[in-house]
Interface confidence: low
């Protein structure tokens, strides 16, 4: 049979290297030789390229080499397939060399901030060694911050006579390291170069861009003064590398601004001892380039009644995240402060906090929380300068099976009844929220029975037992990840009772 007609011819001019054409050969049953016929020099000249490989994958491609390739030019390319039964020709295809030229990537040799111009870096590069002198080049510049995985892209063109091979990338974050890569193509071409090697560059440092401020109110002391722990951190979206030399804090009673106290610190928290009335606290951070905008927080008076609006709250784990959702009765509240810390018996040292706006849910990546640790999560509604009553729940980012079972005791042994009691597993050993307890019991040599009760129950009465019989009993505590048995206990029912 005749060979299949070559289809899907595609050609690329690797600039100043070679012109390579490929095609789909079809299913060949016998040895087929391919000849690529081209006309060039605007139809004035013609020549052939013959595949000389016997491996089928290499036979579907053929290359023409320099020096007989120059831009600009128009080519016709036709592929002939020949076997013992005859020859078949492809359709004639037409190519403008400028449209299929592919260059080497450009070389970025410098990425630098421009002195005095904020949030910008200048990229300088060397055009590909091999690029048509007669054509303009188009470029795609892609960039990302060093700790991001998603690229942003910007496209631009350079005139061939433009000796200035630089691009000013603006609208960036201050004092942030960026990864830059560049590719180019002849303006008329559909083929882009490969990406250049990546180069790093950093935008100029600026004054700190702002602070978020929060507080932990503690009970009033004997003298009526109240300890308030002030907490702050860089505003969301602040550059990762942003440097701070220190913080200025000033505070005064709401009723009298003349009684302003000021202090400096380099820490990220501060304990104030305030009177029982309401106070305003303000602060700024500063570095060698200036001060941040002022962050302000109102501390309510001890007797002040805070508003309540959160009606229900729940936590669940979904797709590697802990999700906390709540419902509010106040439609005008759209900012919330979330606090979370591990539920340990000692005073919490690692309080974390974060604000949420325009949403009644909060998510945190599972890996930001310790697995098998119980967290106390509180949500505070915030309306203007007022902070409402928090709603608190406990949640685990990841649950495990308890590391020990409940400590169990047998009480009130009767002829046919017994009371099984157990203690709660210590917080540190639970590894999750205990959702139920299961009591397993079995007469010696008999069938086993079990009874499951909810997690609020810490004792259970077994009935309808056999008199004067040895039993083994065990209690299992379960989380959503599974259960762990406590130690097994043996007891023997009485042979008779005074009440019989």
């Amino acid at each position: 049979a005749l060979p299949a007609k070559p289809e899907n011819i595609s050609c690329v001019y690797y600039y100043r290297k070679n012109l390579t054409c490929t095609w789909s050969p079809g299913k060949e049953t016998s040895y087929t030789q391919y000849t690529v016929k081209r006309t060039y020099a605007f139809g004035e000249k013609h020549d052939n390229c013959t595949t000389n490989s016997s491996t089928s994958e290499n036979r579907a491609s053929c290359s023409f080499f320099l020096p007989r390739i120059t831009i600009p030019d128009n080519y016709t390319i036709e592929v002939e397939a020949e076997n013992g039964d005859g020859v078949i020709k492809s359709h004639m295809t037409y190519w403008r060399l400028e449209n299929i030229a592919k260059t080497e990537p450009p070389k970025i040799f410098r990425v630098k901030p421009v002195l005095g111009i904020k949030r910008m870096i200048q990229i300088e590069w060397i055009k590909p060694e091999l690029a048509p002198v007669s054509s303009d080049l188009k470029y795609t510049l892609r960039f990302r911050t060093v700790n991001s995985t998603s690229w942003m892209e910007v496209n631009f063109a350079k005139n061939r006579k433009d000796k200035n091979q630089t691009y000013n990338l603006t609208g960036l974050q201050p004092f942030t390291e960026y990864v830059i890569a560049l590719r180019c193509a002849v303006k008329e071409s559909k083929f882009w170069s490969d990406w250049s090697q990546e180069k790093m560059g950093m935008t100029e440092e600026e004054a700190p861009c702002g602070l978020e401020l929060w507080r932990v109110l503690k009970p009033a002391e004997a003298d009526g003064r109240r300890p308030v722990r002030l907490l702050w951190k860089k505003a969301r979206g602040a550059p990762v590398l942003e440097k701070t030399l220190g913080y200025n804090i000033w505070y005064y009673p709401e009723s009298n601004t003349n009684l302003t106290e000021t202090m400096n610190t380099t820490n990220q928290q501060l304990e104030l001892h305030l009177g029982g009335e309401s106070f305003w606290v303000s602060m700024i951070s500063y570095n060698s380039l200036g001060k941040s905008p002022v962050a302000t927080l109102r501390i309510p008076a001890i007797q002040e009644k805070s508003f309540q609006c959160i009606e229900v709250m729940q936590a669940c784990v979904a797709e590697d995240q802990l999700v906390v959702k709540w419902q509010s009765s106040a439609l005008d509240v759209n900012t919330w402060m979330i606090e979370w810390f591990p539920d340990v018996d000692s005073e919490p040292t690692t309080l974390s906090w974060e604000s949420v706006s325009q949403a009644t849910n909060w998510t945190i990546q599972q890996d930001k929380l310790k697995p098998f640790w119980c967290y106390n999560i509180s949500v505070y509604p915030m309306l203007h300068d007022k902070v409402g009553e928090p709603y608190s729940i406990q949640a685990y980012a990841k649950e495990g099976v308890p590391s020990e079972g409940p400590e169990t005791k047998v009480e009130n042994i009767g002829v046919k009844t017994v009371t099984i009691t157990w203690k709660e597993i210590p917080k540190s050993e639970r590894k999750g929220i205990i959702c139920n307890y299961t009591i397993f019991y079995q007469a010696e040599g008999g069938k086993g029975f079990s009874k499951t009760v909810n997690s609020s129950i810490l004792q259970y009465g077994l009935e309808s037992l056999k008199r004067k019989t040895s039993y083994i009993v065990q209690v299992m505590a379960s989380t959503s990840a599974g259960g762990t048995n406590g130690t097994s206990i043996n007891f023997k029912t009485l042979s008779f009772s005074v009440f019989e």
């Epitope: 320099l66 020096p67 040799f109 091999l130 000796k163 091979q165």
Partner: antibody, heavy 121, light 107 residues
Framework: QVQLVQSGAEVKKPGASVKVSCKAS????????MNWVRQAPGQGLEWMGL????????SYNQQFQDRVTITADESTSTAYMELSSLRSEDTAVYYC??????????????WGQGTLVTVSS | DIQMTQSPSSLSASVGDRVTITCQAS??????LAWYQQKPGKAPKLLIY???TEAQGVPSRFSGSGSGTDFTLTISSLQPEDFATYYC?????????FGGGTKVEIK
Amino acid sequence: QVQLVQSGAEVKKPGASVKVSCKASGYTFTGYIMNWVRQAPGQGLEWMGLINPYNGGTSYNQQFQDRVTITADESTSTAYMELSSLRSEDTAVYYCARDGYDDGPYTLETWGQGTLVTVSS
Amino acid sequence: DIQMTQSPSSLSASVGDRVTITCQASEDIYSFLAWYQQKPGKAPKLLIYNAQTEAQGVPSRFSGSGSGTDFTLTISSLQPEDFATYYCQHHYDSPLTFGGGTKVEIK
């Protein structure tokens, strides 16, 4: 650092050929175009042609088209300029000069020390 | 081919003088103009390219200006080491051509 070292002075008879070499070091030889420029005694500078060592591509001044051949040997990072059918007016100092790529292929950034070719019967 | 015309062909000046050399192209070469300095028995040295960009290590007293067809090299305050011959050259396309040169001599 970038350096171009040319071969020594030559004395040739009219009608003969001369081949001047230019050994490059301190950079990637195939990445930069090499130009040849000559200067007759007491005269100005005259561009003769160039070669792209990456692919051997050349471009010549029409005035020398038939007599000059510029070649490059990637393995030794050396460029050569051969001028044939010498006449007395070809007596000159011949320079190789590497382009400064980012400044365009025709800016002569680094020069060899020059080779004096004397054509005399 | 593009012709480059330099003037004057020579000039005499004293140390500290401001010196101006002009170069004219026979057609529009945009900003693709270079200036070279050559001292007797030495290879030329690139001073300026793209009409006004100083090459690496060139003293700031050398400056270039112009675009299109008319270009100028200025030495703001002539120093003893500046007495030499200066050439302009277009770097627009092949073939490259140079101006005839301007010899700067001591007055």
